[in-house]
Amino acid sequence: NECPKLQPPVYGKIEPSQAVYSFKDQVLVSCDTGYKVLKDNGVMDTFQIECLKDGAWSNKIPTCKIVDCGAPAGLKHGLVTFSTRNNLTTYKSEIRYSCQQPYYKMLHNTTGVYTCSAHGTWTNEVLKRSLPTCLPVCGQPSRALPNLVKRIIGGRNAELGLFPWQALIVVEDTSRVPNDKWFGSGALLSESWILTAAHVLRSQRRDNTVIPVSKEHVTVYLGLHDVRDKSGAVNSSAARVILHPDFNIQNYNHDIALVQLQKPVPLGAHVMPICLPRPEPEGPAPHMLGLVAGWGISNPNVTVDEIILSGTRTLSDVLQYVKLPVVSHAECKASYESRSGNYSVTENMFCAGYYEGGKDTCLGDSGGAFVIFDEMSQHWVAQGLVSWGGPEECGSKQVYGVYTKVSNYVDWLWEEMNSPRAVRDLQVER
């Protein structure tokens, strides 16, 4: 009642290995690492067979089949390439995930290499079975920002793609009678979030109450260069409008806000986010040079009061920009305290501009980012937001532009962008 001698399967083994197998003896067939037992189209780790009374085995010896991890999952804002010939997806094959450069980069700077494991899953040394995350690259425009000193007041045009984070925010408040329409700027922080000044998104009321405009009345344009031609721009409606809870209309303290877009915008050469600074109370140091862009008043012959009185919000057709030095807090405070009117430059603000005037931001530039190049990270960082200016005309002598100090609000911004109230859980790199 002996059963015939067994031959182990290719890439497999039989246990126990005996010279003779008698009635009721059992053997366990298993495969080498990276292979699985294949029996009747079923895949299993081991297979047991028994020597029967009539000297036959209860089953034929199964085969060992190489583990196949299958087609790798697609990566949002990324792609997968095969390192192994013939695009193999079997055990020990390698694939590499990469992000759509230069607009996205891999979180945690992982290699992106995944190997087909013995368990049939694509595995990375660091992330294990989790897929990598492609995050937007911030503060690195596809065109290098030039060193020329240009100005918004009487300035020349910015070129398309120089300020890919620049957003035009148009508010058409149809709840007002008659309807009220104005605009400002903002800066893209991620595919779904715009940073701007609170006063841009405050309902233009006849009293000083701070009430945000309804989200239905906000339209955001990205990748825009010339306001007369919006065909190439991405326009998006708002899912949420968030003003800083402590925004004070009397002194413009905490003049910062967020808009969550209805749907994420595709990034590209003309639409890229700006980086946020590290949370530090100092803000940018005096004399540091920053750039700010906007579609605000660029005609030095038109006075702000004329524009306010006429009711028109005159703007530049083509995006303008200016390079301005940061002014010391003490100098700025002193310049405003010497003026009539209740001007307070708080610790949540900083100033920029030239003592002699001539270069400045102006009405309509509100909410735009004052960006400074960070030598350490080699990124442009939004250190300020265009907030307010003195009673004189834009670009007047010893009247500095005042900017919201973004570094004081970084924690608040992350909190809001990652709060459960946010319409979707969108990841943004800190």
Epitope: D173, T174, S175, R176, V177, H199, S203, R205, R206, D207, N208, T209, I211, S214, I249, Q250, N251, Y252, V304, D305, I308, G341, N342, Y343, W388, P391
Partner: antibody, heavy 114, light 112 residues
């Protein structure tokens, strides 16, 4: 067109309460606050408070914080003002206004008398 | 609290005359940042609800005749009616909206 229609005149006894209504139509009710103003016979205007229908935020003139309670019913686009512990001093015409005072109700006369 | 004082308390003019009335506030109503004075003017005709004439000290409400003009800044404001008509018989109130709301005592305009 925009209209604010206020409830009819009220004759109430001292110590009692009364609830006045102001029904809005013809504009975005939730996006515009409703103000309430008091005018005693032959006297000037006194601001009582306002309510913002979108989130129910209220602001009151300090002199009316214990006297008036403002509420809204968004489904019917109606604002309400309840006046408590009435005395003869509360006998007045009460107006509601909206869209930042561009539109006013016709007023409700409240008479407090025993 | 901001106190609003109107003067005169009443005045009588003939039709066609120019009239000015004053409103003073106990503190400045100008918000430098917005370059706006938070002051409004209202007209209340006998037996009627008040009507908004001017807001932000000088912006005329739509539909208001251009004979009504608001001016002033800070704490001193004026409402001018360039050529008074018979239908302008009313009490005129100013109101601050710089910090909540406060009405002035009113100026009663009578036609001679």
């Amino acid at each position: 067109q925009v209209q604010l229609k206020q409830s009819g005149p009220e004759l109430v006894k001292p110590g009692a309460s009364v609830k006045l209504s102001c029904k809005a139509s013809g504009y975005t009710f939730t996006s515009n606050d409703i103000n309430w103003v008091k005018q005693r016979p032959g006297q000037g205007l006194e601001w009582i408070g306002w309510i913002y229908p979108r989130d129910g935020t209220t602001k009151y003139n300090e002199e009316f914080t214990d006297k008036a309670t403002l509420t809204v019913d968004v489904s019917s686009s109606t604002a309400f003002m309840e006046l408590h512990s009435l005395t003869s001093e509360d006998s007045a015409v009460y107006f509601c206004s909206s869209v930042e005072d561009s539109y006013w109700g016709q007023g409700t006369l409240v008479t407090v008398s025993s | 609290d901001i106190v609003m004082t109107q003067s005169p308390s009443s005045l009588a003019v003939s039709a066609g005359e120019k009239v000015t009335m004053s409103c003073k506030s106990s503190q400045s109503l100008l918000i430098s940042r917005t370059r706006k004075n938070y002051l409004s003017w209202y007209q209340q005709k006998p037996g009627q609800s008040p009507k908004l004439l001017i807001y932000w000290a000088s912006t005329r409400e739509s539909g208001v005749p251009d004979r009504f003009t608001g001016s002033g800044s800070g704490t001193d404001f004026t409402l001018t009616i360039s050529s008074v008509q018979a239908e302008d018989l009313a009490v005129y109130y100013c109101k601050q909206s710089y910090n909540l709301y406060t009405f002035g005592g009113g100026t009663k305009l009578e036609i001679k």
